[in-house]
Every structure is written in structure tokens, then in C-alpha cells.
Amino acid sequence: RPSFSLVEDTTLEPEEPPTKYQISQPEVYVAAPGESLEVRCLLKDAAVISWTKDGVHLGPNNRTVLIGEYLQIKGATPRDSGLYACTASRTVDSETWYFMVNVTDAISSGDDEDDTDGAEDFVSENSNNKRAPYWTNTEKMEKRLHAVPAANTVKFRCPAGGNPMPTMRWLKNGKEFKQEHRIGGYKVRNQHWSLIMESVVPSDKGNYTCVVENEYGSINHTYHLDVVERSPHRPILQAGLPANASTVVGGDVEFVCKVYSDAQPHIQWIKHVEKNGSKYGPDGLPYLKVLKHSGINSSNAEVLALFNVTEADAGEYICKVSNYIGQANQSAWLTVLPKQQAPGREKEITASPDYLE
């Protein structure tokens, strides 16, 4: 995240009534793999409803059905897990409702606690067919990001085969994972290719890598564990927003920043500027100007509209959001083209989002 030398103050001043934000934890819909799930968009008076998953537009396909205010997912898989949103567009405004979908069995990593189905994961090979390690059940490894409430049990699995039978070891954040690294240690069930951690706590957050190897090769797979506490969170910004944009000189452009926050957020739009001919202050940090912020005199702060743009408006625009817990920021670039060139949305160079927790 960038450091800033501010031309204008950017302090915590959340003044705008929170009509645009969901000020609570998103509702969680849980489904087991293979089940169907139906969710109703809990927004009133919606003329048009659009859906997103993890910030990406969601359209109908052979498993996803969108009918009016309902979203149906048929034959759910772990890939369907994520942060969903429905946006109701009305004539005067729009409103977004967020919810989580978690497609998983009772405990994490798509497996039931007793490992009753584990036998097929332990593949015996003909002793003549020497073979480097390989994954035997990639479906159970699809869900890489596991957001688990504190005190729950987590299981990560890496079902594999090979000849001779490979060995499995686990790393946490790229280093050997030792029993003493967590209170209560952990269990490894080699016959089920699994790592089990009971009663997870925030310090268990991180990347867990299984390394499966024999004399013919080595393969690995990484899971990310996020331990969700029942405490307020800093803002989350929808992935891919604001999006890069281009327009011709004299044209208009809009940047949108979609905010999810369980505490009242304060939104600021900031741009790199020059001061006395320099882009950087004496401390080496860039000069930044607050173009817009949420407050009593500002309309929808999630949108920054620029009219009749000039070449001087080109550059990076930062959406910075803070609540009393923390901050998040994402940025996008505006390209201003000479009059004769046609503008277009620059999907291919969308700024990479600043993912949080």
C-alpha cells in the first residue's frame, strides 16, 4: 500500500449517513458440494438487478440461473464459494447487498470429519510402474482460500499417488510447520493426505503448503487460511474497482469504488499532483490531492465523476476508504486520448486490487 504526502488532510472523518453501505457482516449461505442453492436478493423496488461474485460480473450459465431477484446455483462446487453481491439499479440510485456463499462440508477442505471416503485417496501402484507424485483428487483441492470462524476445526487435503508411495510434509508461510508453532499442535493423517488444526485462532492465518515427493519428483499445493474473528473489520473494496478508463479530451469519465464495511466508512478520492513543479515532497513521498470525500456536502462518494477532461487529468486515481478499524485503497488509471482517437474501457490493464485479509 502506498505512503502519501498529502496536499490536503486525509483524516478519519466519516460524516456521510451510511445509506450506501452494508454495516453488518454479510449473511453466509452454506451448501454442501452437489447441492443446489437459491438466494433471494434482499433489496426492495429493484428495476434491474445485476449480480457479481468476488467483484466479477455474474451471468447465467448451465449451473447458474438468474430469475428476477433470485440466484440459483445448481450442483454447487467449492469454486462457487465467495463474496456475492446483487445490485439493484433504480431510476435515481443504486443499492448493493452482499452475502457469502460457502460450499464446503462440515469442516474445511471438502471432507467429512471421519474420512470415511478417504480410502480411495490412498492409491496403490504396480511396483513396476515407477511414477512421480500426482494429485488423485483435485476436486478436493479446488478451494484454496478458506475463511473459517475462530475456534473451528480446519482440514487441508492433498490426495496424491505415485510409485514409490510419496511422502507428505507441510509448510506454513514457506517454512517447515512444526508442532510447537501452534498451541495444541496439529494432526497429520498420512493415509488421508490431510492436515488438521483444531480450534483455530487468528495467529493460524497464513499459507499452508503440502509438499508431496518421492525419488521421481515433487509436487506442492498451497491453501490460504483466514481466521475470521467476531469483531469489526476494516473496509473491503470490490475487486477490480475502480477500473482503468480512457476518454478523449473534452470527454466525461466515471470511476466507481464499491465499499463493504461493517463500520461506517469514510471514502476519499485522491490524485497524484504536482506542487511547485515537483511530483514529490522533500520526504520523497508523492504529493496527493483529495478530490472528493464522503461528507455532508458530497453526493454518492463511491463515484468520482470527471467532466470535460483535459490531458492534465490523466494519471492515477486512488479510492481510499477508512473506518475506525483500518484502511483500504485501490487505484485506477485514466488515459486521456487526443480528440481523433476513440475511447474504450481498458479491461486488459485493470489495476490489480489491494486484497485484504
Epitope: 505512503s3 451510511p18 454495516i23 487468528p202 463500520a263 461506517q264 477508512s322 475506525y324 483500518g326
Partner: antibody, heavy 113, light 107 residues
Framework: QVQLQQPGAEVVKPGASVKMSCKAS????????IHWVKQTPGQGLEWIGA????????SYNQKFKVKATLTADKSSSTAYMQLSSLTSEDSAVYYC??????WGQGTLVTVSA | DILITQSPASLSASVGETVTITCGAS??????LNWYQRKQGKSPQLLIY???NLADGMSSRFSGSGSGRQYSLKISSLHPDDVATYYC?????????FGGGTKLEIK
């Protein structure tokens, strides 16, 4: 687990300054605001201000803007509050808190000649 | 600044009873209200955030309600361990003002 360690007490002379520390552990220091709160028997709890260690952003209660200066050292995961021109009115317990969710034990500041 | 008025200032109740503490804000704070419990000689502990959400590790005997300008904290089936001073706090806008506190005692 999340911990915020503060020195137990500071005794200072009127007119002097004091700089108290708040050492954070058990979480990513740069991800959360550190708030400072004053507790006195007469006034109850008062919010002094906050600092975001990632970029040094600060926000102050206007009442304490001249009195308090907030800083943070990312390398040691420590937040600091300096109080200047101390008077008997500044005698109080000062807490640091991570986003009001986790609180330090507090530093008792006694201003005495 | 948003003014937070908390009542009562002190409260005495018997074990097993249900008690309610209220907080009023000088303007609409849209549910941006936290409750804290401070036991004698200890630091404050987050009890309820966002007016209604129970914080980690706190007993479900505590519940928060309210919206707009009026909020309340309910403690059901009072335990001797609940003896403390309870504070509400505006977290909508800076300065994040606290209520004056309610000292809860057991009869």
C-alpha cells in the same frame, strides 16, 4: 494472541513532556488504527486520537490537538503518544487500543511537582 | 461533536435479574455504537459493536439493540462477575465520544 504492552506508570513534573509507548504483538501492526483514550475519575473516557501505522495518517480530537502528538514505528510495532506542557489536569490513565477491540493495560501518568 | 448521554449513572440489581442501560446520541448515528465493559482495575473490553453484534469471547447474556439516536444494552440473568462500569461510544464520526458510564453493582 493480540497484545498491547504499555508501561505501568510515569511520574512527571508540571510543564514537562512525557512520551509513552504501546508495543503491539500478535497481529499485523500496519493493518489497524491505534487509538488513544484518556480515563479520569471525573471525565470518564475521552478519545484523544488515532494513528494508522501503515502510512502515519493521524486523526485528533480537537481538544487534544495541541496537547498530544501520535507517532508509530513500524520496525518495532510500537505506537507512541507524547503529551506536552503537562499540568495536573493531565494526570490520568492513558490507554492505547487496536481499533477499540483490544486494549493495553494503560499507563498511569501522574503530574506532580 | 456528537454528544452521548448514558443512563443511569449507577445501577444496583440482584443476581439473576435482567438490567438495561440506555444511551442517547445528539444526532442519528446510524447504528455506529459500541459498548464496553470495564472491571475495577482492568482495561475496557469491547462488548458489543455496531449496536447489536456481540464481540468475541463475551457472554450471550449481553445483547445490544437500537437505531437512530437511541440504543440500549441488556444484561440478562445477572452474574456476580458482571459487576463493572459499562460505557457506550459513538464510532460514526470523530471525535469518537463516550457516554458517561454506568456503574453496575450487585445487591
Amino acid at each position: 494472541q493480540v497484545q498491547l504492552q504499555q508501561p505501568g506508570a510515569e511520574v512527571v513534573k508540571p510543564g514537562a513532556s512525557v512520551k509513552m509507548s504501546c508495543k503491539a504483538s500478535g497481529y499485523t501492526f500496519t493493518d489497524y488504527y491505534i487509538h488513544w483514550v484518556k480515563q479520569t475519575p471525573g471525565q470518564g473516557l475521552e478519545w484523544i486520537g488515532a494513528i494508522y501505522p501503515d502510512n502515519g495518517d493521524t486523526s485528533y480530537n480537537q481538544k487534544f490537538k495541541v496537547k498530544a502528538t501520535l507517532t508509530a514505528d513500524k520496525s518495532s510495532s510500537t505506537a507512541y503518544m507524547q503529551l506536552s506542557s503537562l499540568t495536573s489536569e493531565d494526570s490520568a490513565v492513558y490507554y492505547c487500543a487496536r481499533a477499540f477491540t483490544y486494549w493495553g493495560q494503560g499507563t498511569l501518568v501522574t503530574v506532580s511537582a | 461533536d456528537i454528544l452521548i448521554t448514558q443512563s443511569p449513572a449507577s445501577l444496583s440489581a440482584s443476581v439473576g435479574e435482567t438490567v438495561t442501560i440506555t444511551c442517547g446520541a445528539s444526532e442519528n448515528i446510524y447504528g455506529a455504537l459500541n459498548w464496553y465493559q470495564r472491571k475495577q482495575g482492568k482495561s475496557p473490553q469491547l462488548l458489543i459493536y455496531g449496536a447489536t453484534n456481540l464481540a468475541d469471547g463475551m457472554s450471550s447474556r449481553f445483547s445490544g439493540s437500537g437505531s437512530g439516536r437511541q440504543y440500549s444494552l441488556k444484561i440478562s440473568s445477572l452474574h456476580p462477575d458482571d459487576v463493572a462500569t459499562y460505557y457506550c461510544q459513538n464510532v460514526l464520526s470523530t471525535p469518537y465520544t463516550f457516554g458517561g458510564g454506568t456503574k453496575l453493582e450487585i445487591k
